[in-house]
Structure formats: C-alpha cells, structure tokens
C-alpha cells in the first residue's frame, strides 16, 4: 500500500507471550509522510478501548518507519489483555488492529514454560 495516509502496522490477531516481572516494550509501527501524527495506546475492556494515561511511552525512528512504544517496567499480571494504538491524523482517528499480551505470572508457575509451549498454547497462560 503506497499512500500518504497514516498507517499503523500491527498485525491482526497478533500476540506476545511475556512474563510478569520482566520489562517489555509494546511497539506500534507508524508510517507517515510529512508530519508525525499524535499516537496513543489504549487497552480493550470488552468493546471499549480505554486510553492509557500517564504511562511511559517513547518514539523510536527507523529508516522508513517510526515506532510508538508503550513501556512495561515491569510487566504485571494485570497487564494481560488486548491493546490498540491509534493515530490522530487530519482530525481523523486511525486505529490499529489489537494485539494481545498473554502474561504468565511466574510466581504461580513452577518453572518458566518454553517459548514453544507458550506460543502454541496461549490459553494456558495467565487469564
């Protein structure tokens, strides 16, 4: 897609398997042409996406893409859930697909499951 619209590159039905207590960066890749849009993160609560206020966020610039990053320092069990970024562009709101964090609470796990286990069985993770 070659256009001068803002585009948010989060894959549909993507997810991340992460551990409580670890640091984690959730990235929203943003493509824009001239002026960088204002981007925010929200967390889904049912069908409503609740804007995340007062959280540590930052920008990272790469060659053809910018990344708006939500920092988890550290990840908490309550961070489990689905997140969406959105951009304000020419007074329109562009929303990304949601991405899901599956948080394993290591206190309740006898040992850390392998990445393969977590990747293939997200329903076993913290819920």
């Amino acid at each position: 897609k070659e256009s001068c619209d803002v585009q948010l590159y989060i894959k549909r039905q993507s997810y991340h398997s992460i551990f409580a207590g670890d640091p984690f960066k959730l990235e929203c890749p943003v493509k824009y042409c001239a002026h960088r849009p204002q981007v925010t993160w929200c967390k889904l609560n049912g069908t409503t996406c609740v804007k995340l206020e007062g959280r540590h966020t930052s920008w990272k610039q790469e060659k053809n893409l910018s990344f708006f990053i939500l920092h988890f320092e550290p990840v908490l069990p309550s961070d489990n859930g689905s997140y969406r970024c959105s951009a304000n562009f020419l007074s329109a709101i562009i929303e990304s697909h949601s991405t899901t964090l599956y948080v394993t609470d290591v206190k309740s796990a006898s040992e850390r499951p392998s990445k393969d286990e977590m990747a293939s069985r997200p329903w076993l993770l913290y819920s």
Partner: antibody, heavy 119, light 112 residues
C-alpha cells in the same frame, strides 16, 4: 509478486515424522502470517495451523496440537511444518500459504507436497 | 469451532449461465474490528487452491468481475454471473474470524 515453493513429495513409515518446507519470495515474511492446510485424496481442506514469522508464535487446530510443529526462519524466508507419529490417515497433499498480516491484501498458496504414509 | 456448510454439494450449469453457491456459518463471522473474514477459494483438479474473494466481497487481483461475493453475519453467497469454461472447479468458503480456521466442504461446479 509473492511466490511459495514447497519441498518435494515424501514417503514415510507409520510412526515416523515428516518435515515439509515452504520458501517465500517477493515478500518480507515478517509482514505476513504463514499457514498450513492439508487435503486428503478426494477430500476437502483442513487447516493445521499458522505462524507469525516476526516472533515465531504459532497457533494450531486442536486436532494437530502436540503433533504438528510449525516454525519459520526469517533469514531464509522459509516456513516448516513437521508432523510426528504419522499414520495412514495423514496421507495427503500439504499446502503452505501466506497472507498479508495487516490488510489481508494477498493470499498465496504453494504448489503442495504429497506425503504418503505407508508400511 | 465454527462449522461452514456449503450448498449445493454439486452444481451443474451450462456455460453462460449464472451460478450461485451458498455458505452458511454456525455463528456470526463479524469480527470485533467490524469486518467479516469470509473468503472464497477456487481449486481446479491437480492444482493448489486460489483465493478469489476476501472480506466477503473484495475480489483478489486478476479475478474476473463475473465473480462476486455477498452476505453478512452467517449467510454468504458466491455468484458467477456468466459461467465460462475455465470456471468449472471446486469452490470452498473459509473463515478467518476465529481460531481454528475452518473450511466449507466444497461445491463442485460441473458442466451440465
């Protein structure tokens, strides 16, 4: 344009494993999902699972959970599907396919790999 | 899992006629993002399937405009306005809304 080339036909003994490869060209596989579907002789299509090559996370149909393993190597733009504990009912053509993870704007299938399980 | 039921199992038509294939889902395919992830595939003997239609009604690049998709919720239709000789094949609907992905059982379009 996006193309997928799969490995060649395999004949396997019951109880053994098979690993089928699928090499993509014309696309950065980090921007896609790659998935596997099989088709037994004269039958319909059956979804096995899919992988996000950007992070290696896979999802499987319950029927194949624990028996199928889907992996991807971003450096070679190749996905793999390994199926273990083979039985005669696993005789089928195995297809890999790739689609755009953001807009679903393309969906391309490989040519298929015939796996025959026979003693 | 979502069950997709296609009808008819076999459809006999003459070239130039209209062909209509139905796909019914056991539950709504409307996703939380407001889109409906229902696709149609065409498979010719000895060949891999090819996607014709995605998101219910969007035609893939290079697909002739005689192919059209419609429907919403649980009921979907693939229509070929005037069947050409190269259209005789098996057609599958499949859903990408929920895991696991599932396919209809297929409809064979044959020459009358």
């Amino acid at each position: 344009q996006v193309q997928l080339v799969q490995s060649g036909a395999e004949v396997k003994k019951p109880g053994s494993s098979v690993k089928v490869s699928c090499k993509a060209s014309g696309v950065n596989i980090k921007d896609t999902y790659m998935y596997w579907v099989r088709q037994a002789p004269g039958q319909g299509l059956e979804w096995i699972g899919r992988i996000d090559p950007a992070n290696g996370y896979a999802r499987y149909a319950q029927k194949f959970q624990g028996r199928a393993t889907i992996t991807a190597d971003e450096s070679t733009s190749t996905a793999y599907m390994e199926l273990s504990s083979l039985r005669s009912e696993d005789t089928a053509v195995y297809y890999c396919a790739v689609y755009d993870g953001y807009y679903e704007s393309f969906d391309v299938w490989g040519q298929g790999t015939l796996v025959t399980v026979s003693s | 899992e979502i069950v997709l039921t296609q009808s008819p199992g076999t459809l006999s038509v003459s070239p130039g006629e209209r062909a209509t294939i139905s796909c019914r889902s056991s539950q709504s395919l409307l996703d939380s993002d407001g889109k409906t992830y229902l696709n149609w595939l065409q498979q010719k003997p000895g060949q891999a399937p090819r996607r014709l239609i995605y998101l219910v009604s969007k035609r893939d690049t290079g697909v002739p405009d005689r192919f059209s998709g419609s429907g919403s919720g649980t009921d979907f239709t693939l229509t070929i306005s005037r069947v050409e000789p190269e259209d005789f094949a098996v057609y599958y609907c499949w859903q990408g809304t929920l895991f696991p992905r599932t396919f209809g059982q297929g409809t064979k379009l044959e020459i009358k």
